[in-house]
């Protein structure tokens, strides 16, 4: 049984809480890396691929060394929500063209959702200010062609990979300061 009603909950160990978030982030990063390798193998596409609807890479928000935990978690959650939306859009819009990647894309979506829930939990446990609900984002336009969709897939996975690296580096750095 839990503590008696009215007794204060044991305060969480912030390092342990942060650590489990880092682990989920690293696991998702590895999934993303493997999927990116598969995508490049099956649908080679040279050069950088951009998608205007994707979040600006968090890295440009400032040097990692100067970041604080609330700003990292807030920014990460906002960016990952956007990537979740883009992965869902990609699976809907490109179902047939990307069917060779489908089981992995589905797993990626599930794990992205799990990390988002973990971030939400971490923010509440560390008593960080909760964000207001996101306003509904405008729907993403379907890709103009199969090739356009493949380029979008490269942009989404590439951006997610870099965002997760930024997150792992930032969270581990912050953990050393706790």
């Amino acid at each position: 049984p839990g503590p008696p009603p009215g007794s204060p909950r044991a305060s969480p160990d912030p390092r342990a809480e942060l650590d489990s978030t880092v682990l989920l982030t690293r696991s998702l990063l590895e999934d993303t890396r493997q999927l990116t390798i598969q995508l490049k193998d099956k649908f080679p596409a040279d050069g950088d691929h951009n998608l205007d609807s994707l979040p600006t890479l968090a890295m440009s928000a400032g040097a990692l060394g100067a970041l604080q935990l609330p700003s990292v978690l807030t920014r990460l959650r906002a960016d990952l929500l956007s990537y979740l939306r883009h992965v869902q859009w990609l699976r809907r819009a490109m179902g047939s063209s990307l069917k060779t990647l489908e089981p992995e894309l589905g797993t990626l979506q599930t794990r992205l959702d799990r990390l988002l829930r973990r971030l939400q939990l971490l923010m509440s446990r560390l008593a960080l200010p909760q964000l207001p609900p996101d306003p509904p984002a405008p729907p993403l336009a379907p890709p103009s062609s199969t090739w356009g969709g493949i380029r979008a897939a490269h942009a989404i996975l590439g951006g997610l990979h870099l965002t997760l690296d930024w997150a792992v580096r930032g969270l581990l750095l912050l953990k050393t300061r706790l």
Epitope: S27, R33, L57, A61, G62, L64, D165, R169, K175
Partner: antibody, heavy 119, light 111 residues
């Protein structure tokens, strides 16, 4: 062929600074982090820090914070490490190494740059 | 910081023999399916070369006689049948937390 080519050996006086370059070729520079590792005679390898060429600034081993500065020139696929306020303990071989995103294992290394600090 | 201790400090074996090198971490470097330990080989005057990453994955171009195993705090690099070119110093490294740290090395010498 994937390779990292570092600048040549340096001899410096105590208190001076040194800046080492590391030119990457054979891969997409922004797909990996660039890490720097120190190997002093008779000492363990020591991680100095890393930088993601996409931006956002480097992260450092606390031991080197304030003295090491990592930068990149994305257009030239080149990374730099500057070490200031040199002392005799900084005499070592310094390596740049390509780091897998989020994992800190180093699959490609530069040939090393020997820095000697002596009065 | 996590401290990695390698043993033995040096090992003398003959070509064709099996080599077993050990690396012990001061705290667990394994979590949820991953062990954040990596192995390198270094020869005099050369840069280190990645052999094994994430405890058991063979790096590109590394011969299959090299293998890595272990979890938690205890890890092993095994060379199944030593070749002349395998005599070198071997380092383990962790990436569980920041900063990544290296072991002090095991020197493998020809008997």
């Amino acid at each position: 062929e994937v390779q990292l080519v570092q600048s040549g050996a340096e001899v410096k006086k105590p208190g001076a600074s040194v800046k080492i370059s590391c030119k990457a070729s054979g891969y997409t520079f922004t797909d990996y982090n660039m890490d720097w590792v120190k190997q002093a005679p008779g000492q363990r390898l020591e991680w100095i820090g890393d930088i993601n060429p996409h931006g956002g600034g480097p992260i450092y081993n606390q031991k080197f914070t304030g003295r090491a500065t990592l930068t990149v020139d994305k257009s030239a696929s080149t990374a730099y490490m500057e070490l200031s306020s040199l002392r005799s303990e900084d005499t070592a071989v310094y390596y740049c190494a390509r780091g897998e995103l989020g994992h800190w294992y180093f699959d490609v290394w530069g040939q090393g740059t020997t820095v000697t600090v002596s009065s | 910081d996590i401290v990695l201790t390698q043993s033995p400090a040096s090992l003398a074996l003959s070509p064709g023999e099996r080599a077993t090198l050990s690396c012990r971490a001061s705290k667990s470097v394994s979590t949820s399916g991953y062990s954040y330990i990596h192995w390198y080989q270094q020869k005099p005057g050369q840069a280190p070369r990645l052999l094994i990453y994430l405890a058991s994955n063979l790096a590109s171009g590394v011969p299959a006689r090299f293998s890595g195993s272990g979890s938690g705090t205890d890890f092993t690099l095994t060379i199944s049948s030593l070749e002349e070119e395998d005599f070198a110093t071997y380092y383990c490294q962790h990436s569980r937390d920041l900063p990544p740290t290296f072991g002090q090395g095991t020197k493998l010498e020809i008997k």
